[in-house]
């Protein structure tokens, strides 16, 4: 559930403290509610970033268990289409620490409306 | 050339247990994800588990979820699987197999062992 | 569960010819980031699987390329342009965009 996927970002931010990525990620700091899983996309593609540039199993491992996460507890809830949404790419750069608790704001938009 | 070795199949009775191993080599095993995937006889193919490459993560279906375990030694580049509280059902020839990841190009098991026959009678 | 139907399940073709298979899934296997983790295995006899395709269409190193891939959403389809006696085996889809993942019943392919 989306608890669980607030522990792996919990997790992921302090897997990175611990290293050095300086990289500047699209970020959705004013998620609209009828945008909210196109938003999650643009998080998600972001995060196998941080994924890559870190070369680190353990960031590897839990951005992977994350994606699994959310692909399930969305896909119970059958196919939402999404219009009028921003592209990942029109979205502001971030540096990471202020990516994630973006993600965490989300998140919990996700916990709030189940 | 990526080789696994999958063991430890045999006969065990209805309620009984079993561990099997695969033993992987010439390729960095701590690297990938790994699977089980078993084969009734004369049947298809289920998914059985998948375990992250780190062995924090693991996955598998309600066919076999709270009875079986999915785990590994990346020191000993080998996966296991301890099969508990064995049905009739279970009865199949397990393979483990490799299993690449997003960041190498996409989701698939590209590599698969020889499989071991587990056979669950009384 | 997505479940994954094949058709057909039993499939004879002369030597030469092409041949066809089609997976259907029970729901769409477009993952949230927009990929598709479809892939095709053979099962030749007596033998393990062995992977073909991935991702819907990519060939897997050292699969032939009269093999391919194509479909999208939930119809899938692996084509042979032309079936060498070495094709003769059991051909499986897989979906591992959703747990739990899911092998298709299986086509069984023979020399006619």
């Known amino acids: 559930n989306w608890v669980n996927v607030i522990s792996d970002l919990k997790k992921i931010e302090d897997l990175i403290q611990s290293m050095h990525i300086d990289a500047t990620l699209y970020t959705e700091s004013d998620v609209h509610p009828s945008c909210k899983v196109t938003a999650m996309k643009c998080f998600l593609l972001e995060l196998q970033v941080i994924s890559h540039e870190s070369g680190d199993t353990d960031i590897h491992d839990t951005v992977e268990n994350l994606i699994i996460l959310a692909n399930n507890i969305l896909s119970s809830n059958g196919n939402i289409t999404e219009s009028g949404c921003k592209e990942c790419e029109e979205l502001e750069e971030k540096n990471i620490k202020e990516f994630l608790q973006s993600f965490v704001h989300i998140v919990q938009m996700f916990i709030n409306t189940s | 050339e990526v080789r696994l070795m999958a063991s430890g199949g045999g006969l065990v009775q209805p309620g009984g247990s079993l561990r099997l191993s695969c033993a992987a080599s010439?390729?960095?095993?701590?690297?990938?994800?790994m699977s089980w995937v078993r084969q009734a006889p004369g049947k298809g193919l289920e998914w059985v588990a998948t375990?992250?490459?780190?062995?924090?993560?693991?996955y598998y279906p309600e066919s076999v979820k709270g009875r079986f375990t999915i785990s590994r030694d990346n020191s000993k580049n080998t996966l296991y699987l301890q099969m508990n509280s064995l049905r009739a059902e279970d009865t199949a020839v397990y393979y483990c197999?490799?299993?690449?990841?997003?960041?190498?190009?996409?989701?698939?098991?590209?590599?698969w062992g020889q499989g071991t026959l587990v056979t669950v009678s009384s | 569960d997505v479940v994954m139907t094949q058709s057909p399940l039993s499939l004879p073709v002369t030597l030469g010819q092409p041949a066809s298979i089609s997976c259907r899934s029970s729901?769409?296997?477009?993952?949230?980031?927009?990929?598709?983790?479809l892939e095709w295995y053979q099962q030749r006899p007596g033998q393990s699987p062995r992977l073909l395709i991935y991702?819907?269409?990519n060939r897997f190193s050292g699969v032939p390329d009269r093999f391919s891939g194509s479909g999208s959403g939930t119809d899938f389809t692996l084509k042979i342009s032309r079936v060498e006696a070495e094709d003769v085996g059991v051909y499986y889809c897989?979906?591992?965009?959703?747990?739990?993942?899911?092998f298709g019943q299986g086509t069984k392919l023979e020399i006619k």
């Open positions: 197999a490799r299993r690449v990841s997003f960041i190498t190009g996409g989701w698939a098991m590209d590599y």
């Open positions: 010439e390729f960095t095993f701590s690297n990938y994800a």
């Open positions: 375990i992250s490459r780190g062995g924090d993560y693991t």
């Open positions: 729901q769409s296997i477009v993952d949230i980031t927009g990929n598709t983790y």
């Open positions: 991702k819907v269409f």
């Open positions: 897989f979906q591992d965009s959703f747990v739990p993942y899911t």
